[in-house]
Interface confidence: low
């Protein structure tokens, strides 16, 4: 199994970043970390989407990776998409330093995210608590600012 993966985030605008993934054991947590720049200050939804297809930009990536057919939630929620990694926080310089440990995504098996698309969104993810239908699907996180296909790393 792969133990490391990487994603280069790019978009039509100024947002770009590099995100690393590391999983030391096949059933263990995945470390997700790196940096994203060019964001507006504040929270931005951060999700793994189903398809590794960026042919028409980030929209080609489809919905959140959700092999268990659950509703959208936060990374600490039982009811969540596999791809629900919550939010990243950009500072006043537009830089988000990412350091997440997640026990639902994996670099192998049914929850494998390799070959899928990582997306950073325009707005904050309400973690499924927004009170409308869109909240249970996307967290009302808005448009897709930048994305990249998650690939195996050395």
């Amino acid at each position: 199994m792969a133990t490391k993966a990487v994603c280069v985030l790019k978009g039509d605008g100024p947002v770009q970043g590099i995100i690393n993934f590391e999983q030391k054991e096949s059933n263990g947590p995945v470390k997700v970390w790196g940096s994203i720049k060019g964001l507006t200050e504040g929270l931005h939804g951060f999700h793994v989407h189903e398809f590794g297809d960026n042919t028409a930009g980030c929209t080609s990536a489809g919905p959140h990776f959700n092999p268990l057919s659950r509703k959208h939630g936060g990374p600490k929620d039982e009811e969540r998409h596999v791809g629900d990694l919550g939010n990243v926080t950009a500072d006043k310089d537009g830089v988000a330093d990412v350091s997440i440990e997640d026990s639902v995504i994996s670099l192998s098996g049914d929850h494998c995210i390799i070959g899928r698309t990582l997306v950073v969104h325009e707005k904050a993810d309400d973690l499924g608590k927004g009170g409308n239908e869109e909240s249970t699907k996307t967290g009302n996180a808005g448009s897709r600012l930048a994305c990249g296909v998650i690939g195996i790393a050395q």
């Epitope: 590391e22 970390w33 926080t89 988000a96 350091s99 440990e101």
Partner: nanobody
């Protein structure tokens, strides 16, 4: 509130080396990720390197193979060993913790100048 103090900066010729240190005012054992950033005059701040408590490391492409990061939780310290320095490495270097809550904790910086 964690206070971070960087040291070790200076003026060095291209190809030279420097070792930056960052000492925290209290234990860093519970701080998962610690980072070195840099900012050159007129440029956006850039994440250079980072290290988590379990030893996972991150390096910007521009410094891979030249810089090494380490931490010593017993000394509440973070280090950045910079080798084969280039003119473009000239910047103010800052030590920082994971921004949780944002913007995390930051030091005042130490200046690195690479000049021939």
């Amino acid at each position: 509130q964690v206070q971070l103090v960087e040291s070790g900066g200076g003026i060095v010729q291209p190809g030279g080396s420097l070792r930056l240190s960052c000492v925290a005012s209290e234990s860093i054992s519970d701080i998962d990720a610690m980072y070195w950033h840099r900012q050159a005059p007129g440029k956006r701040r850039e994440l250079v390197a980072g290290i988590t408590n379990d030893g996972t490391e991150y390096f910007a492409d521009s410094v891979k193979g030249r810089f090494a990061i380490s931490r010593d939780n017993t000394k509440s310290s973070l280090y950045l060993q910079m080798n084969s320095l280039k003119l473009e490495d000239t910047a103010m270097y800052y030590c920082a913790t994971l921004p949780n809550p944002p913007p995390g904790y930051w030091g005042q910086g130490t200046q690195v100048t690479v000049s021939s």
